[in-house]
């Protein structure tokens, strides 16, 4: 019984609905009593839904899984999850027995955008050309952890002096603080790039000093 | 008439290997999971693995997982047990059956394992 | 996994009595339950599955009834071929297969 899911891990934002497409090749004839369906975990082996005697088992993941009933007689054994989760990441397997089994595994990767950068300046004040500050760049509740990049007025990269933290928080979302010690010009401006790998979404911030008095865009 | 034919067993030391094979005829061997269900002396029966009809999808039970290994042949119509790292607690009858909706409606006469040092 | 008690453990009576053989379940199995007899020496066959369904060439003194938890084997009337070992096997979990211990039907 040949078992089929997308090649590619399905994305899905904290908070929404992802769907873990599963399908297989019914045979003429094929009544959803003969049906049997286990979704579980991969690695840890957890149930998380089942499908069995023609009669949907329910979920066994926190009650946040459907199954799509209308379409199970066409072959779609695809699984509904609710409210994804940073710790619903990872790999599902979709096992199918009908008179033969089969089964195939679906990843899911789950993402979250960064907020905003906000840019705060150490010492911010009495400040000339020669001076060391620290910028420190920070965004919040985003997942999977951040890619963080400083550059210049000119867009020349700044990789010295750069420090960059990533905590996350209890729901498993990170908060990123990136900190780059710089000697001043004569004015110049410091740009923070956060960058979400799995959702390819940049959050920009800057900030731009000039002598008396500096501007936060 | 369906026949399922094993062989392969014998008497191997704990840590050796044995492979075993099943010869399936009078049916289409291709379009139904295989299994290996075993029986210790004087015991009752145990799963131990299956494999689908394709070969593209296996099953073991705990206490075999990383040391047996299922697969099949649907050229020769064979199904095979390749058993590494055999224990004492392997000495079985280990029988082979054709499997319809995860029960057992043919098996074979059995192949004796014996793992003794 | 999901545990299989089969009782009694042996079982003593005459032929053309009435043997009623019990298999119980750790949780729900629904009605994915198969027996099989086991005579000395030879190998398993199927007698029921589906909990109640007789198997191609099962004589009809043979029949299944349960589903959830509780199932049960009966054989009408006992001919001498069936004084055997009778094991119920689950297969809702068919990740995890899993039989009872086994019934021993013997002659008193």
């Known amino acids: 019984l040949e078992v089929q899911v997308p090649e590619d891990p399905v994305v899905a934002l904290v908070g929404t609905d992802a769907t873990l497409c599963c399908s297989f090749s019914p045979e003429p004839g094929f009544s959803l009593a003969q049906l049997n369906l286990i979704w579980q975990l991969t690695d840890t082996k957890q149930l998380v839904h089942s499908f069995a005697e023609g009669q949907d088992q329910g979920s066994a993941y926190a009650n946040r899984t459907a199954l799509f009933p209308d379409l199970l007689a066409q072959g779609n054994a695809s699984l509904r999850l609710q409210r994804v989760r940073v710790a619903d990441e990872g790999s599902f397997t979709c096992f199918v027995s009908i008179r033969d089994f089969g089964s195939a595994a679906v990843s899911l990767q789950v993402a979250a955008p960064y907020s905003k950068p906000s840019m705060t300046l150490e010492p911010n004040k009495d400040l000339r050309p020669g001076d060391t500050v620290t910028i420190t760049c920070s965004s919040y509740r985003g997942y999977p952890e951040a890619e963080v990049f400083w550059q210049d007025g000119q867009g020349v990269p700044l990789t010295g002096n750069v420090t960059t933290s990533q905590m996350a928080n209890e729901q498993g979302l990170f908060d990123v603080h990136s900190v780059l010690r710089v000697v001043l010009g004569a004015n110049g401006t410091y740009s923070c790039l956060v960058r979400n790998p799995v959702l390819q979404q940049d959050a920009h911030g800057s900030v731009t000093i000039t002598g008396q008095p500096m501007t936060f865009p | 008439d369906v026949q399922l034919v094993e062989s392969g067993g014998g008497v191997v030391r704990p840590g050796e290997s044995l492979r075993l094979s099943c010869a399936a005829s009078g049916f289409t061997f291709s379009s139904y999971a295989m299994s290996w269900v075993r029986q210790a002396p004087g015991e009752g029966l145990e799963w131990v693995s299956s494999?689908?009809?394709?070969?593209?999808?296996?099953l073991y039970a705990d206490s075999v997982k990383g040391r047996f290994t299922i697969s099949r042949d649907s050229s020769n119509n064979s199904l095979y047990l390749q058993m590494n790292s055999l224990r004492a607690e392997d000495t079985a009858v280990y029988y082979c059956?054709?499997?319809?909706?995860?029960?057992?409606?043919?098996w074979g006469l059995g192949t004796l394992v014996t793992v003794s040092s | 996994e999901i545990v299989l008690t089969q009782s009694p453990g042996t079982l003593t009576l005459s032929p053309g009595e009435r043997a009623t053989l019990s298999c119980r379940a750790s949780r729900s199995i629904l009605t994915s339950l198969a027996w099989y007899q086991q005579r000395p020496g030879q190998t398993p066959r199927l007698l029921i599955y589906?909990?109640?369904s007789r198997a191609t060439g099962i004589p009809d003194r043979f029949s299944g009834s349960g589903s959830g938890t509780e199932f049960t084997l009966t054989i009408s009337s006992l001919q001498s071929e069936d004084f055997a070992v009778y094991y119920c096997?689950?297969?809702?979990?068919?990740?995890?297969?899993?039989f009872g211990g086994g019934t021993k039907v013997e002659i008193k």
């Open positions: 494999i689908s009809g394709s070969g593209g999808s296996t």
């Open positions: 589906g909990a109640n």
């Open positions: 059956a054709k499997a319809r909706n995860n029960f057992f409606d043919y």
């Open positions: 096997q689950q297969y809702y979990d068919w990740l995890t297969i899993t």
